[in-house]
């Protein structure tokens, strides 16, 4: 019996969770979709609309500033990661509507469901980079004055993207289409070819590198930052706290079900009742993780200091406001006004 995680996108589906027992039905044969699949479709639709529009707006707003403003570089990269993932949603949506039938071919099966994993790794690595930046602004302001520039920020983002691509490769490689006969359909999923150890290894690496390790390091990082900022009366900011909590918490909250079900399924036998139950929830877990792709613009842009006012103003006349807004750049250090302000305010915008 092969182990096949069919798609919803990667965890098989959209990713590689759905391990399919070949002697069990690939789905209920009724014409109606399961409740978890219906919920997933609703979430996908909302995420697509909000995510595409929101991230497109963020990209538009930040693209003009990204050559000079370091914060814009971070937000631009996060928005690009989210926007890319959102582009796969119509395909994933269609597949679920068709009871996980995948008529889009092998290349699409390898690439599209892997986008959410690329997003996961890119987002968490970019968040780690942003957190490091925040940390340095608080604890090494002099270093920042000398070395913190747009060039270094772009290099950090390039490294984050490179690592994200590298970490997405395993799911990409194991993703295959498979013809099913009872009922007739083509499934897209992850095939580990009987190798349960390999499946577990991929799930564990994903859990550790995409969730547990970042959770630990970001928690420590922000604990130090908040302790420092709270210790100075002038910088006690509830907005700061809200932004930090939203930034970190949203990522981990929305990825938690996916990660938990993924690790559980890698340790369960495909015929076990728990496995079959989790398998039915796979699309829903993936859709829940996808919420990250539309919530980031709201958190990082609307709530972020320096971008809140700009976004509000730019909605009626986006181009005019963005293009005419003044930025002060110090030639020697690629500094921006927001950088100077941030340090002057002792990281009020953490």
């Amino acid at each position: 019996m092969n182990s096949f995680n069919y798609t919803t996108p990667d965890y098989g589906h959209y990713d590689d969770k759905d391990t399919l027992d070949l002697n069990t039905p690939v789905d209920k044969t009724s014409n109606t979709l399961r409740v978890p699949d219906i919920l997933a479709l609703v979430i996908f639709a909302v995420v697509f609309l909000v995510g595409v529009l929101g991230n497109a707006l963020v990209v538009w707003v930040t693209a003009f500033e990204a050559k000079r403003t370091i914060n814009a570089i971070w937000f631009l990269n996060l928005a690009v990661a989210d926007f890319l993932s959102c582009l796969a949603l119509p395909i994933l949506f269609t597949s679920i509507v068709q009871h996980h039938h995948w008529p889009f071919g092998g290349a699409a099966c390898s690439i599209l469901p892997s986008l959410i994993l690329l997003n996961m790794y890119a987002s968490i690595l970019l968040l780690a980079t942003i957190s490091a930046d925040r940390f340095l602004l608080v604890f090494k302001p002099i270093w920042c004055q000398n070395f913190r520039g747009a060039g270094l920020a772009w290099i950090a983002c390039a490294v984050a993207w490179g690592l994200a691509l590298l970490l997405t490769i395993p799911s990409f490689l194991y993703r295959v289409v498979r013809e099913e006969y009872f009922p007739p359909k083509v499934l897209c999923g992850v095939d580990y070819s009987h190798d349960k150890r390999r499946e577990r290894a991929v799930a564990i690496v994903r859990l550790v590198l995409g969730f547990l390790w970042p959770l630990l390091t970001l928690t420590i990082c922000y604990t130090f930052i908040l302790l420092r900022t709270w210790s100075r009366r002038a910088t006690r900011s509830t907005k700061t706290l809200k932004v930090v909590v939203a930034v970190v918490a949203s990522f981990f909250i929305f990825w938690l079900p996916y990660q938990v079900t993924g690790i559980m399924m890698s340790f369960l036998e495909p015929s076990s009742p728990t496995f079959l139950l989790l398998n039915k929830l796979d699309s829903l877990c993936v859709s829940f993780a996808y919420i990250n792709c539309c919530i980031n613009p709201i958190i990082y842009v609307v709530a972020g200091q320096g971008f809140q006012g700009r976004l509000r103003k730019s909605l009626p006349s986006l181009l005019r406001n963005v293009l005419t807004e003044e930025s002060v750049v110090r030639e020697s250090k690629s500094f921006t006004r927001s950088t100077v302000d941030t340090m002057a305010q002792k990281t009020q915008a953490v």
Partner: antibody
Amino acid sequence: DVQLQESGPGLVKPSQSLSLTCTVTGYSITSDSAWNWIRQFPGNKLEWMGYISYSGRISYNPSLKSRISITRDTSKNQIFLQFNSVTTEDTAKYYCARASIGFDYWGQGTTLTVSS
Amino acid sequence: DIQMTQSPSSLSASLGEKVSLTCRASQEISGYLSWLQQKPDGSIKRLIYAASTLDSGVPKRFSGSRSGSVYSLTISSLESEDFADYYCLHYANYPPTFGGGTKLEIR
């Protein structure tokens, strides 16, 4: 046109092992579809036994899983059904059939009689 | 496993007559149903798949329909070569199962 032809020993004794062959002509068994074994008992009841797909993936009827194996020889374009130990209850006519959307092509069948 | 209950088990009819055979599925099979014809020599041929789609080369007098969980095969005007055994088969999940068959005989 796709044609399937089954062949086998005809008569075997209980507890013996045996192999039935399905030779496919006019179509490559590795191009697509699944290649199935189905049997029909003396009372005319039909039972799906299992398949081997174009990619080599195998699926069995859970009721028979431990007793049979399905293999193939791609160079000869043949599918095989092996029994490790037959009983008189395995007396039936054995068909191979192609599955794409349901079973669209069937062989003529080969009769297997298990008797001491 | 899904049980396919086929009726009648045997049927006598005359040439030119219209006959209907039915098959009831114990669970939802969403139209994943075929009708098969088995001639006296044992050869099996598929007539209909997806409940109502006629296979190429099958005469138009054969038709398939569905009403809920009940599937029907109708022969509008019997001809001599139609007297044979007929089986329904679902392929909605594992394992696919067959109806018990209907023996169509000349009256």
